[in-house]
Interface confidence: medium
C-alpha cells in the first residue's frame, strides 16, 4: 500500500491487547515516518522512523518503554525492511530484517487502546502524547499484520494498492502534476542569504500556482504563479507587498527554463534566460520560512493566506493546481525530485501531458540543446567583456575586465585566505582614481562545499566585502571537508566611486573564482551495522562478515584497508576458515567481505573483540564488539517418523526431522547421533557432497545440513517376512556446541 505523506488507515481494536505480534514491511526514503500507532487515552504503542532509525514507544500506565535500532543502520534507504515486534509474557522484542535489535521487560498489564490502530499516520487524532511524533509515512507498507490480522484491508481512496513508482523516482524524473488538486510539498525554502528556485516548466495552464513558501509570524510569504499565461512573483513582508511580472509567455505546452532568485535586496524571475527584477532599493529583508515549500498547488492554509491578501486570485483559481510538469527542479542549488517530497497529491512520476501535446514537431526546435548539461553555466565566458564608452580617461584604454582571477587553493577541510593575488586588478587603481574600498565584491552563488567567511561586521549576512578587506585578510574560505577536488564561487564585482569609468563597472561584472581542493587522507572508521553486540552459542563458531562490522573510509577502497585485532594473540577467537586453530590477528577488508573469518568460542566467558582499521597511512580509533556466549537451547521442531515398504529406502527430510536453536543470526552446526542399535535396517549418508550417483554409506551420525540437502536416508534391510508392520525405534541425540539433547 502507498502512503503519500498525509494519509492513514484506521483499524478498530475490540479488546485490550494482552499479547502483541506485530509484523510490518515498509520502504521509504524519508528519515521521518509514522508507521503505526495503537492509541488509548494514555496507553499507546508507537512505531516511527525518526532520523532514519526505528523507534518503538510503549506506554503502559505510567511506565514508558523505548526500543530503537542502532544509529549506524538507517532504514530510510528506500529498501523494504521487515520489522517484527512481539510483546509476550512481560517481554518485548524488536527485530529488523531478521536481526534482534532490542528487547526489554515490560509491565504485565494489557495495552488498553480503545481508539484503535492508526497505520501510516494519526489523522486528526488530538492526543497529548502525539506532540513531537514523526510526519505521516511517505512510502510503502508492503505488509502489516497484528496478531495475524491484516492492517491493510480495506484501503481508503487516498491510500493506493501496491508501491507507487514516484517513491523510487530519481531526481531526473519530472514532477507530473495531473490535477485538479495536485500538490507536492518539500522541505522549507530558506532565503536567509539568498534563495533560488529553478525548474523547467511545461504546461498549458494560463492560471496556476507554481510555488508557495509561508514565512514569519505576520502572514509573510513568497508566491510564484502563472497569471494570464505569464510568470508572476509576489513577496509579502510585514512592510508591504512586492509584485513582479515576467513578459515571456509560458502557457504554450513547450518547456521553459524558470529561475526565481531572491535576496535581501532584490527579487528576480527569469524565463528562458530573460530576467525581470525589482530595483536594488526594494529592500525585501529576510523571510523566515514556516512550513513546507508547496509546488504546483496550494493547501487550505496557503489558499487562505492568498485570499486574505486579495491579490486578484479568485477562489476557483486558488483551489486549482498546475496541469503540467516540472523538470530539473533545484532549490537553493540542490536537486530535488519526487523522492525528496514530504507529501504529494495526485502526482505522477514523469512528464505525461495530454496526448495533443505530443505532436511530432512540438520539441523539434529544442533538439539542438538536448545535450546541454544543466550545470553548463560555468562554461560561459565570465566576466562578459566590457566595452568602455568613448571619452574615458586613458587608463581605461583597451579595458575589458577589472580583475585577473587566480584559483584559490585550500586543503580538504581547511581554510585559505582570499588574497590580492586571487583577484588582482588589471589596471592601476590610483591612476583610475579608485580606492580599494570602492571595489565591492558580492557573492552571488556560494561554493557547493564551503563557506566564504567574512570578518567584517554585518558582512556575513550581506555576503559583501571590498578589495580593501581582501588586502586586510578579512575574507577566508572554509572548506567543509568533502571529497570533491574542485569548486567555485561566483562573485559580482562593482565599483562604487563617482569618477569617470566604464558603466559596466557601475553595473557590476560577474567572475568565477575557481577553488582547488587539495585532498587530505581521512582516517577510516569501524561501524557495526547491527549494533556492537554479537551473540554466539557456547562452543560454536560464527562467521564474521560485513554484517557484523565494516570499515568506512570516504577516500580509500576496500583493497587498501587492513584490520588489526588488538589484545594478546594467544587464545584469540578470530580465525580464518581455511586455517582453523590459528589466530588471525590481522586480516584484509577483502577477506572480511569474502566471509573468510570466523569467531570461535571455546568455552568460558566470550572474549570481546577490539579492532582497529588502517588505510596504510592512518588508523581508526579502536572499536569494540561485545560478544556474549549463550548456552545453546535445542528444541525439536519436527519428528514425524517414516513409513516405507520393506526392502526399500526413504530419505529423511526436514519435514520429518528438524530442530530449532536459540542462535541469533548464526548458522550453527547441529549434529544427530544414533544412540541405540537398529533392528530392521540402517541409517545411511550419501558421500561426495551429495552428487547424483554418489554412494550411500551406513552412518551413526549426521548433521542437520545433511538432512536439508537430502543426503540422509533409512534403508530397510530386514529379509524376514512379517505378518504385521514392523516399527524401528530410532534413538537419537542432538548436539549443538557441547549441549546435548537425548532421547529424541
Amino acid at each position: 500500500a502507498s502512503f503519500f505523506g498525509e494519509n492513514h488507515l484506521e483499524v478498530p481494536v475490540a479488546t485490550a491487547l494482552t499479547d502483541i505480534d506485530l509484523q510490518l514491511q515498509f520502504s521509504t526514503s524519508q528519515p521521518e515516518a509514522l508507521l503505526l500507532l495503537a492509541a488509548g487515552p494514555a496507553d499507546h504503542l508507537l512505531l516511527q522512523l525518526y532520523s532514519g532509525r526505528l523507534q518503538v514507544r510503549l506506554v503502559l500506565g505510567q511506565e514508558e518503554l523505548r526500543l530503537q535500532t542502532p544509529a549506524e543502520t538507517l532504514l530510510s534507504d528506500s529498501i523494504p525492511h521487515t520489522v517484527v515486534l512481539t510483546v509476550v509474557e512481560g517481554w518485548a522484542t524488536l527485530s529488523v530484517d531478521g536481526f534482534l535489535n532490542a528487547s526489554s521487560a515490560v509491565p504485565g498489564a494489557p495495552l488498553e487502546v480503545p481508539y484503535g490502530l492508526f497505520v501510516g499516520g494519526t489523522g486528526t487524532l488530538g492526543l497529548p502524547y502525539l506532540r513531537g511524533t514523526s510526519r505521516p509515512l511517505r512510502g510503502c507498507l508492503h505488509a502489516a499484520t497484528l496478531n495475524g490480522r491484516s492492517l491493510l484491508r480495506p484501503l481508503t481512496p487516498d491510500v493506493h494498492e501496491g508501491c507507487a513508482e514516484e517513491f523510487s523516482a530519481s531526481d531526473d524524473v519530472a514532477l507530473g502534476f495531473s490535477g485538479p488538486h495536485s500538490l507536492a510539498a518539500f522541505p522549507a525554502w530558506g532565503t536567509q542569504d539568498e534563495g533560488t528556485l529553478e525548474f523547467t516548466l511545461t504546461t498549458q495552464s494560463r492560471q496556476a500556482p507554481l510555488a508557495f513558501q509561508a514565512g514569519g509570524r505576520r502572514g509573510d510569504f513568497i508566491y510564484v504563479d502563472i497569471f494570464e499565461g505569464h510568470l508572476r512573483a509576489v513577496v509579502e513582508k510585514g512592510q508591504g507587498t512586492v509584485l513582479l511580472h515576467n513578459s515571456v509567455p509560458v502557457a504554450d505546452g513547450q518547456p521553459h527554463e524558470v529561475s526565481v532568485h531572491i535576496n535581501a535586496h532584490r527579487l528576480e524571475i527569469s524565463v528562458d534566460q530573460y530576467p525581470t527584477h525589482t530595483s536594488n532599493r526594494g529592500v525585501l529583508s529576510y523571510l523566515e520560512p514556516r512550513g513546507s515549500l508547496l509546488l504546483g498547488g496550494l493547501d487550505a492554509e496557503a489558499s487562505r493566506h492568498l485570499q486574505e491578501h486579495r491579490l486578484g486570485l479568485t477562489p476557483e483559481a486558488t483551489n486549482a493546481s498546475l496541469l503540467g510538469c516540472m523538470e530539473d527542479l533545484s532549490v537553493n542549488g540542490q536537486r530535488r525530485g519526487l523522492r525528496e517530497a514530504l507529501l504529494t497529491r495526485n502526482m505522477a512520476a514523469g512528464c505525461r501531458l495530454e496526448e495533443e501535446e505530443y505532436e511530432d514537431d512540438a520539441y523539434g526546435h529544442y533538439e539542438a540543446f538536448s545535450t546541454l548539461a544543466p550545470e553548463a553555466w560555468p562554461a560561459m565566458e565570465l566576466p562578459e567583456p566590457c566595452v568602455p564608452e568613448p571619452g574615458l580617461p586613458p587608463v581605461f584604454a583597451n579595458f575589458t575586465q577589472l580583475l585577473t582571477i587566480s584559483p584559490l587553493v585550500v586543503a580538504e577541510g581547511g581554510t585559505a585566505w582570499l588574497e590580492w593575488r586571487h583577484v588582482q586588478p588589471t589596471l592601476d587603481l590610483m591612476e583610475a582614481e579608485l580606492r580599494k574600498s570602492q571595489v565591492l565584491f558580492s557573492v552571488t552563488r556560494g561554493a557547493r562545499h564551503g563557506e566564504l567567511e567574512l570578518d567584517i561586521p554585518g558582512a556575513q549576512a550581506r555576503k559583501m566585502f571590498t578589495l580593501l578587506d581582501v588586502v586586510n585578510r578579512k575574507a577566508r574560505f572554509i572548506h567543509d571537508g568533502s571529497e570533491d577536488t574542485s569548486d567555485q564561487l561566483v562573485l559580482e564585482v562593482s565599483v562604487t566611486a563617482r569618477v569617470p569609468m566604464p558603466s559596466c563597472l557601475r553595473r557590476g561584472q560577474t567572475y568565477l573564482l575557481p577553488i582547488q581542493v587539495n585532498p587530505v587522507n581521512d582516517p577510516p572508521h569501524i561501524i557495526f551495522p547491527h549494533g556492537s553486540l554479537m551473540v554466539i552459542l557456547e562452543h560454536t563458531q560464527k562467521p564474521l562478515g560485513p554484517e557484523v562490522f565494516q570499515a568506512y573510509d570516504p577516500d580509500s577502497a576496500c583493497e587498501g584497508l587492513t584490520f588489526q585485532v588488538l589484545g594478546t594473540s594467544s587464545g584469540l577467537p578470530v580465525e580464518r576458515r581455511d586455517q582453523p586453530g590459528e589466530p588471525a590477528t590481522e586480516f584484509s577488508c577483502r577477506e572480511l567481505e569474502a566471509g573468510s573469518l570466523v569467531y570461535v568460542h571455546r568455552g568460558g566467558p566470550a572474549q570481546d573483540l577490539t579492532f582497529r582499521v588502517s588505510d596504510g597511512l592512518q588508523a581508526s580509533p579502536p572499536a569494540t564488539l561485545k560478544v556474549v556466549a549463550i548456552r545453546p537451547a535445542i528444541q525439536i521442531h519436527r519428528s514425524t517418523g517414516l513409513r516405507l515398504a520393506q526392502g526399500s529406502a526413504m530419505p529423511i527430510l526436514p519435514a520429518n526431522l528438524s530442530v530449532e536453536t536459540n542462535a541469533v543470526g548464526q548458522d550453527v552446526s547441529v549434529l544427530f547421533r544414533v544412540t541405540g542399535a537398529l533392528q530392521f535396517g540402517e541409517l545411511q549418508k550419501q558421500g561426495a557432497g551429495g552428487v547424483e550417483g554418489a554412494e550411500w554409506w551406513a552412518t551413526q551420525a549426521f548433521h542437520q545440513r545433511d538432512v536439508e540437502q537430502g543426503r540422509v536416508r533409512y534403508l530397510s534391510t530386514d529379509p524376514q517376512h512379517h505378518a504385521y508392520d514392523t516399527v524401528e525405534n530410532l534413538a537419537l541425540e542432538v548436539q549443538v556446541g557441547q549441549e546435548i539433547l537425548s532421547n529424541l
Epitope: A42, V59, Q62, E63, E64, L65, R66, Q68, P107, T122, T124, L125, G126, L127, P128, Y129, L130, R131, G132, T133, R217
Partner: antibody, heavy 121, light 111 residues
C-alpha cells in the same frame, strides 16, 4: 507512592563543580524522564534539561549546555546533575521533577524537595 | 524560545472571592488539538505542585475550585472561591517546544 529524595545543601567555592543527586522510588525509574529545574532566590523557575534513564538520552536548554551535565544510574534509581565552573549566578535551589509520560514531552507531576547550592568564597 | 508573560505580578483577594491570573505566550502553544500549557502552585520553601495540565485538565487530588481555560496564546487560571490555603505563587509553563519555559509568576495574597 512516588518519591524523589534530593541530596542536602551544598556550599561551594567559585570555579568549583557540584554534583547533586535525586533518588527515585515508587515507580519505574528507567522508563520516565527526569527533569531538572533551577530557581534563584526570590525568582522564577528555569528548565535546565531532562534525561531518559533507560538509555541515557538527554535534552538540554541551550542556556545550560556546557554548564549542567545530566546522568542517571539505573541500578540505584538515582539521577544526577553536575554543575561546573560555578559563579554567584549559579547560587539557587535546584529541583528534580519526574516527567509524566502521558503528556509528551512530559509535564512535571512529582518534584524533589530541592537542593540549595550556595556559591561563595 | 517561547516567552510567557504572567499578569498581574501580584494580587490580593478576599476569602471567598474569585482570583484570575492570566498568561500570554509569545507564540501559539497549540498542536494536535491540544494546548500545551500547564499551571503550578508554589509555596515558600516547597517545590512547585502541578495543578492544571493541558490548559484545562485538573490534576488528580487538586480541588475543583481551580480551573484553567484558553488556547493558542492566551490562558487563564481561575480560583473560585479563594481559600486561606491558596496563598502562594502561581506559574504557567509551556511544553509545546523545547526549551520548556515558565511564566514569571503571580503572587496571590489574601486581604
Amino acid at each position: 507512592q512516588v518519591k524523589l529524595q534530593q541530596s542536602g545543601p551544598e556550599l561551594v567555592k567559585p570555579g568549583a563543580s557540584v554534583k547533586i543527586s535525586c533518588k527515585a522510588s515508587g515507580y519505574a525509574f528507567s522508563r520516565s524522564w527526569m527533569n531538572w529545574v533551577k530557581q534563584r532566590p526570590g525568582q522564577g523557575l528555569e528548565w535546565i534539561g531532562r534525561i531518559y534513564p533507560g538509555d541515557g538520552d538527554t535534552n538540554y536548554n541551550g542556556k545550560f549546555k556546557g554548564k549542567a551535565t545530566l546522568t542517571a544510574d539505573k541500578s540505584s534509581s538515582t539521577a544526577y546533575m553536575q554543575v561546573s565552573s560555578l559563579t554567584s549566578v549559579d547560587s539557587a535551589v535546584y529541583f528534580c521533577a519526574r516527567g509524566n509520560t502521558v503528556v509528551v514531552p512530559y509535564t512535571m507531576d512529582y518534584w524533589g524537595q530541592g537542593t540549595t547550592v550556595t556559591v561563595s568564597s | 524560545d517561547i516567552e510567557l508573560t504572567q499578569s498581574p505580578a501580584s494580587l490580593a483577594v478576599s476569602l471567598g472571592q474569585r482570583a484570575t491570573i492570566s498568561c500570554r505566550a509569545s507564540e501559539s502553544v497549540d498542536s494536535y488539538g491540544n494546548s500545551f500549557m500547564h499551571w503550578y502552585q508554589q509555596k515558600p520553601g516547597q517545590p512547585p505542585k502541578l495543578l492544571i495540565y493541558l490548559a484545562s485538565n485538573l490534576e488528580s487530588g487538586v480541588p475543583a475550585r481551580f480551573s484553567g481555560s484558553g488556547s493558542r496564546t492566551d490562558f487563564t487560571l481561575t480560583i473560585d472561591p479563594v481559600e486561606a490555603d491558596d496563598a502562594a505563587t502561581y506559574y504557567c509553563q509551556q511544553n509545546n517546544e523545547d526549551p520548556l519555559t515558565f511564566g514569571g509568576g503571580t503572587k496571590l495574597e489574601l486581604k
